[in-house]
């Protein structure tokens, strides 16, 4: 089935003018066309769409729960996007599958030239490694703390027990 | 207790909350904590998630309103991490499941993620760390004289 | 800006082949991406296939897939689609189109440059 007619015949809530619509939103935050966008810059791209495809602000956590995946120097794939928003307002469903295969192959026909991308996290894991991060980090700087106050403890101490030498 | 949190935390568990918060009334079930905390990068067990419950629905309705969860969390972040939940955290960035990181990666994860430490801390982190210069982190050993007290 | 001029079409029998020729002149030749694309009477535009710049493998549409062959000559900046095993309902106008291999699109229908077609007939 081709997917103009697809999304243009049926009575689903998503039509053609929504994907032109997200890959004219595309091409201001992406430039240069690597396909790729910055995680930090996530949160403003989703923000600026229009309905129905738009994830209004605060949206940094759903983002996260949609668990996108992610590349070396945490960029996401803009195929990835628009399946996860898609997904949203389609909900998950064999059309929706059907529907990504055929963006999917669409899409990697129509840009012959790019390298195909190997994920290597997701929002949700990048989330939990973050955390995860943290709590290394806190123990270490407790540690170097309790570490240099020992050190200290040891110093005040020494300096204390020579004074009577003199 | 839920002063201790910052602003940015506050928001963001207010928006976590509100997500799943699906008809609006100010509360989320027991049942929808864990995905909650999951959306939080918290990775709860379930006994943890019972005990959490436990604490703060005090009538047992089987629901959370906000500021009992804010004061739930607060708890969570304040609790000084135990031995077993550092080798835990750990454990996310050995890839081979061998009980070793790579000093790099090491490196790359503490100056990139989270509450980002200095180039001298990691530095410093590493020589403690890698303690044969081999390049690689025998992260159980390193945890245990972390919290050696 | 880029020129394509289509050429290779015409009649054959069912089982037949056919080899379509697409000349560009204008820009770097080098650096764009190409495709072919078909319009059968009454019917949507449909992708048969693209190759890119890099060493990447072309792209096929299954009704093509293991019949066709995208191939394409830098120095003579022309892209060649050669058609083996022909059936009627590979009959259509078929489309050369470009577009520069740094750009992204969604889509073929997205390319910015097309040639004016050849029609190629499968008999039966």
């Known amino acids: 089935e081709n997917f103009n007619v697809a999304t243009e015949e049926s009575s689903e809530p998503l039509g053609e003018d929504d994907f032109e619509m997200f890959y004219e939103t595309w091409e201001k935050f992406d430039p240069d066309a690597t396909q790729f966008i910055a995680y930090s810059r996530l949160s403003d791209f989703v923000d600026t769409l229009q309905e129905p495809l738009r994830i209004a602000k605060p949206n940094k956590i759903k983002l996260i729960t949609l668990d996108l995946p992610m590349v070396p120097g945490d960029k996401i794939h803009c195929l990835d996007i628009l399946f996860a928003l898609t997904k949203e307002v389609l909900g998950d469903s064999g059309e929706m599958d059907a529907l990504k295969q055929t963006m999917e192959e669409k899409f990697m026909a129509a840009n012959p030239s790019k390298v195909s991308y190997e994920p290597i996290t997701t929002t949700l894991k990048r989330k939990h490694e973050e955390v995860c991060a943290i709590k290394i980090q806190r123990a270490y700087r407790r540690h170097l703390l309790q570490r240099s106050m020992k050190q200290a403890s040891y110093m005040y101490r020494h300096s204390h027990d020579g004074s009577g030498d003199d | 207790m839920a002063d201790q949190l910052t602003e940015e935390q506050i928001a963001e568990f207010k928006e976590a909350f509100s997500l799943f918060d699906k008809d609006g009334d100010g509360t989320i079930t027991t049942k929808e904590l864990g995905t909650v905390m999951r959306s939080l990068g918290q990775n709860p067990t379930e006994a943890e998630l019972q005990d959490m419950i436990n604490e703060v629905d005090a009538d047992g309705n089987g629901t959370i309103d906000f500021p009992e969860f804010l004061t739930m969390m607060a708890r969570k972040m304040k609790d000084t991490d135990s031995e077993e939940e550092i080798r835990e955290a750990f454990r996310v960035f050995d890839k081979d499941g061998n009980g070793y990181i790579s000093a790099a990666e090491l490196r790359h994860v503490m100056t990139n993620l989270g509450e980002k430490l200095t180039d001298e801390e990691v530095d410093e982190m590493i020589r403690e760390a890698d303690i044969d210069g081999d390049g690689q982190v025998n992260y159980e050993e390193f945890v245990q004289m972390m919290t050696a007290k | 800006q880029v020129q394509l001029q289509e050429s290779g079409g015409g009649l054959v029998q069912t089982g037949g082949s056919l080899r379509l020729s697409c000349k560009a002149s204008?820009?770097?030749?080098?650096?764009?991406?190409l495709a072919w694309s078909r319009q059968a009477p009454g019917k949507q535009r449909e992708f048969v296939a693209s190759i890119g710049v890099t060493r990447n493998p072309p792209y096929y549409s299954g009704s093509v897939k293991g019949r066709f062959t995208v191939s394409r000559d830098n120095a003579k900046e022309t892209v060649y689609l050669q058609m083996n095993d022909l059936k009627p309902e590979d009959s259509a106008v078929y489309y050369c189109?470009?577009?520069?291999?740094?750009?992204?699109?969604?889509?073929?229908?997205?390319?910015?440059?097309w040639g004016r077609g050849t029609q190629v007939t499968v008999s039966s």
């Open positions: 204008g820009r770097a030749f080098a650096r764009y991406d």
């Open positions: 189109a470009a577009k520069d291999a740094s750009v992204t699109v969604a889509t073929i229908e997205d390319y910015p440059y």
